[in-house]
């Protein structure tokens, strides 16, 4: 019957024996033998390995492509990849931030419910009755109609979701 060999979490089974994995920031250059331990080598600049591994090559650091609206958020190290984010006014279109899209402004009649972030687009909502937004904006919320009554004025023109009410002097009763 074949032996069942169990290696520790920082080892791997190779040709029937447990070899040490290479630590993050390094790569394997030679498997262990009965006479020699695993040989590892540090990753070169511009490369990384994030986990204990037996990989022969380190991974290339990611390039944050400016033509795609990307910029470096966090520089890569020997143990971690470069983290990209989007330039001002743009947000990532995926979890890994592979591409960017312009923030969407809320059009007239809609107000900003949540402003855009690095990873999310603007959240807009229609202005409810009694509120309006008269411009495309990345940050303006719906504003309440002016209360003509409070100003002792009367409504000359009703408000809409896109326009404020127009107040005027009350016409004197004859």
């Amino acid at each position: 019957l074949g032996q069942c060999v169990t290696c520790s979490d920082k080892q791997y089974l190779h040709d029937g024996q447990c070899c040490d994995l290479c630590q993050p920031g390094s790569r394997l250059t030679s498997h262990c033998t009965a006479l020699e331990k695993t040989q590892c080598h540090p990753c070169d600049s511009g490369e990384f390995s994030a986990q204990w591994n037996r990989e022969i090559r380190c991974h290339q650091h990611r390039h944050c492509e400016p033509n795609q609206g990307l910029r470096v958020k966090k520089e890569g190290t020997a143990e971690s990849d470069t983290v990209c984010t989007c330039k001002e006014g743009q947000h990532c279109t995926s979890k890994d931030c592979e591409a960017c899209a312009q923030h969407t402004p809320c059009i007239p009649g809609f107000g900003v419910m949540e402003m855009a972030t690095e990873t999310t687009d603007t959240v807009c909502h229609p202005c409810p009755v009694g509120f309006f937004s008269n411009q495309s904006s990345l940050f303006e919320k719906c504003y309440p109609w002016t209360s003509c009554e409070d100003k002792n004025l009367e409504v000359l023109q009703k408000g809409t979701s896109q326009t404020n009410v127009i107040c005027g002097l009350k016409s004197r009763m004859r």
Partner: antibody
């Protein structure tokens, strides 16, 4: 005893395709990266492509990228090199090799001649 | 690409000591390896990681060096050592081989 045996070489016209298999025995195939290295007639050695243990990562020299595909079948202990859009400069003896950062075992090689 | 430069040919007498050099265009740390290839045969690994002797290779073969300058030494040379010797680096992508040094015995 470790053995690597390449086959299916031969004469092929430019622009055509050829698939080279390499049968491995005498070791746990999935425990090793594998590679193809070629040697043009009377010339030196040239690394062509490598593949990781489970085939999830592949690496190619620039001159064959997009034309050659390295793959493996661990259940059959076989390495493959699919060569498409062949050119005269691909004429060489192709060796399959077992490797870490060096090639510790090589096949006997198979000759591929690209000529019209 | 990292270019590895080897002298093309050497001729020595059996029993002598011979050194075959390999110079890299960029530093390759100690990721340099040596192979022997006899006519009509596949290459055979002799030395790995600059100075480690491969199992089954006679102790007449030894390797040294780091960075850009490496040496394969055969001491003493035997008639059976007639072959071409190649160095190979695995520090920079793509992995490259030297042009080979043909060793002939007088």
């Amino acid at each position: 005893e470790v053995q690597l045996v390449e086959s299916d070489g031969g004469l092929v016209q430019p622009g055509r395709s050829l698939k080279l298999p390499c049968a491995a025995s005498g070791f746990t195939f999935s425990d090793y990266y594998m590679a193809w290295v070629r040697q043009a007639p009377t010339k030196g050695l040239e690394w062509v492509a490598s593949i990781s243990y489970d085939g999830s990562s592949t690496y190619y020299r620039d001159s064959v990228k997009g034309r050659f595909t390295i793959s493996r079948d661990n259940a059959k202990s076989t390495l493959y090199l699919q060569m498409d859009s062949l050119r005269s400069e691909d004429t060489a003896t192709y060796y399959c090799g077992r490797h870490s950062s060096y090639f510790d075992y090589w096949g006997q090689g198979v000759m591929v001649t690209v000529s019209s | 690409d990292t270019v590895l430069t080897q002298s093309p040919a050497l001729a020595v007498s059996p029993g002598e000591r011979v050194t075959i050099s390999c110079r890299a265009s960029d530093s390759v740390s100690t990721l340099m390896h040596w192979y022997q290839q006899k006519p009509g045969q596949q290459p055979k690994l002799l030395i790995y990681l600059a100075s480690h002797l491969e199992s089954g290779v006679p102790a007449r073969f030894s390797g040294s060096g780091s960075g850009t300058d490496f040496t394969l030494t055969i001491d003493p040379v035997e008639a059976d050592d007639t072959a071409t010797y190649y160095c190979q680096q695995s520090w920079n992508d793509p992995w490259t081989f030297g042009g080979g040094t043909k060793l002939e015995l007088k």
